[in-house]
Interface confidence: low
């Protein structure tokens, strides 16, 4: 009476051993097919046939110009990316059976997207702007406006803003102020200028002195012997032709106009490096 249930238990165990429960999940680098776990194909190989109870998974290496970069059950390998020269692309790194080709752009060009499917020419920074960051194969030129004290007079994908010339360090004076597009223009400190300017300054001072003396004399001169009641001070009108009173400005202006203006040595107008085709 007791043997039958025992036999049933034993048969149950035996049946379980021969026909295990179909797995619902497989180990890493395996896949579930027809209720059994098969090995995935390694990178660089494609699936030819699934495993069976009696055979292993069959895989074949990818052909030329093909790849598979993961453990897979793909029946076809992927074609290597083609770096199309007509789009400005070139191979940065060749593809292998396990990796795709990496494209980049020709020199002077950069990718239009992260996938680098086509290229565009690096932009140039206009006059008044300098290159903050030179373009790479994947990023465009970054420009920045030239700050005070700096200039850029060319359109370039390479040149930074250049500092204004320091006239003082060359014993010159600034004759024309710089802008963000132009350098300062330096000129010589002429002795002639000094010889003319100094007498003019003395002339002006002498004229002022004369005026002061004249005022004092007019103020002291008694107009009536009889005592007068307290008067309001009168406005004094100075004659227009007083010596030296109006000579400084025209002389100064003329001299300034005749002053030679020189471009400093070594600061010729910059010419941009020819951009690539």
């Amino acid at each position: 009476m007791v043997r039958l249930p025992l036999q049933c238990v034993l048969w149950g165990c035996l049946l379980t051993a021969v026909h295990p429960e179909p797995p619902t999940a497989c180990r890493e680098k395996q896949y579930l097919i027809n209720s059994q776990c098969c090995s995935l194909c390694q990178p660089g190989q494609k699936l030819v046939s699934d495993c069976t109870e009696f055979t292993e998974t069959e895989c074949l290496p990818c052909g030329e110009s093909e790849f598979l970069d993961t453990w897979n059950r793909e029946t076809h390998c992927h074609q290597h990316k083609y770096c199309d020269p007509n789009l400005g692309l070139r191979v940065q790194q060749k593809g292998t059976s396990e990796t795709d080709t990496i494209c980049t752009c020709e020199e002077g060009w950069h990718c239009t997207s992260e996938a680098c499917e086509s290229c565009v020419l690096h932009r140039s920074c206009s006059p008044g702007f300098g290159v903050k960051q030179i373009a790479t194969g994947v990023s465009d030129t970054i420009c920045e406006p030239c700050p005070v004290g700096f200039f850029s007079n060319v359109s370039s994908a390479f040149e930074k803003c250049h500092p204004w010339t320091s006239c003082e360090t060359k014993d010159l004076v600034v004759q024309q102020a710089g802008t963000n597009k132009t350098d300062v223009v330096c000129g010589p400190q002429d002795r002639l200028r000094a010889l003319v300017v100094i007498p003019i300054i003395f002339g002006i001072l002498f004229a002022i002195l004369l005026v002061l003396v004249f005022i004092k004399k007019v103020a002291k001169k008694p107009t009536n012997k009889a005592p007068h009641p307290k008067q309001e001070p009168q406005e004094i009108n100075f004659p227009d032709d007083l010596p030296g009173s109006n000579t400084a400005a025209p002389v100064q202006e003329t001299l300034h106009g005749c002053q030679p203006v020189t471009q400093e040595d070594g600061k010729e107008s910059r010419i941009s490096v020819q951009e690539r085709q």
């Epitope: 020269p85 007509n86 400005g88 070139r90 191979v91 060749k94 085709q277």
Partner: antibody, heavy 121, light 106 residues
Framework: EVQLVESGGGLVQPGGSLRLSCAAS????????MSWVRQAPGKGLEWVSI????????YYADSVKGRFTISRDNSKNTLYLQMNSLRAEDTAVYYC??????????????WGQGTTVTVSS | SYELTQPPSVSVSPGQTASITCSGD??????VSWYQQKPGQSPVVVIY???KRPSGIPERFSGSNSGNTATLTISGTQAMDEAYYYC?????????FGGGTKLTVL
């Protein structure tokens, strides 16, 4: 039969100019990139320039940049090399070569017989 | 500028294997071609894209390329293989040739 035939070589004085031509036959000329390669007497191969198949993108060796110009006329199946400001060091046999594909991946699979350029006063 | 370095000469006995190397910075990332040139003749491509053999080139010619070195291998070298061999790669918008190796079959 795939064939490349160069012409236009000769003796020229320093500073002078020459135009080399390369007539192609036996293949679809417009589908392939083309190169010029030179070889100075007793020296190795030196690449000069390449032009791709249709857009006409061109590249040059630093030694000839600004002096030489590569061009092609697909309607005439002809490749050209305009050489200006020639120097003594440009003396060489100039080969025209067909790239194995539309660009540089495939190697130069067909070469002409070469044309000799001599720069001397 | 980029340079490809080859040994000036390699000697091999008939029937032996000849190996000609070509080295350059990260050369394995670039496609390499090999050319054979016999005296008075134009060059002929024997290997392209590192290891591919054009039709008409004997199977004894093979190529590999990884790291900083590309190698042209000629197994069962014959007297007719005596020639100059040049490696070539495309590097950032220019084509670069190695200096050439003279293969002598003893």
């Amino acid at each position: 039969e795939v064939q490349l035939v160069e012409s236009g070589g000769g003796l020229v004085q320093p500073g002078g100019s020459l135009r080399l031509s390369c007539a192609a036959s036996g293949f679809t000329f417009s589908s392939y990139a083309m190169s010029w390669v030179r070889q100075a007497p007793g020296k190795g191969l030196e690449w000069v320039s390449i032009i791709n198949n249709n857009v006409g993108r061109t590249y040059y060796a630093d030694s000839v940049k600004g002096r030489f110009t590569i061009s092609r006329d697909n309607s005439k199946n002809t490749l050209y090399l305009q050489m200006n400001s020639l120097r003594a060091e440009d003396t060489a046999v100039y080969y025209c070569a067909k790239e194995g594909g539309d660009y540089y991946y495939y190697g130069m699979d067909v070469w002409g017989q070469g044309t000799t350029v001599t720069v001397s006063s | 500028s980029y340079e490809l370095t080859q040994p000036p000469s390699v000697s091999v006995s008939p029937g032996q294997t000849a190996s000609i190397t070509c080295s350059g910075d990260k050369l394995g990332d670039k496609y390499v071609s090999w050319y054979q040139q016999k005296p008075g003749q134009s060059p002929v491509v024997v290997i392209y894209q590192d290891s591919k053999r054009p039709s008409g080139i004997p199977e004894r010619f093979s190529g590999s390329n990884s790291g900083n070195t590309a190698t042209l291998t000629i197994s069962g070298t014959q007297a007719m293989d005596e020639a100059y061999y040049y490696c070539q790669a495309w590097v950032s918008s220019t084509v670069v040739f190695g200096g050439g190796t003279k293969l002598t079959v003893l």
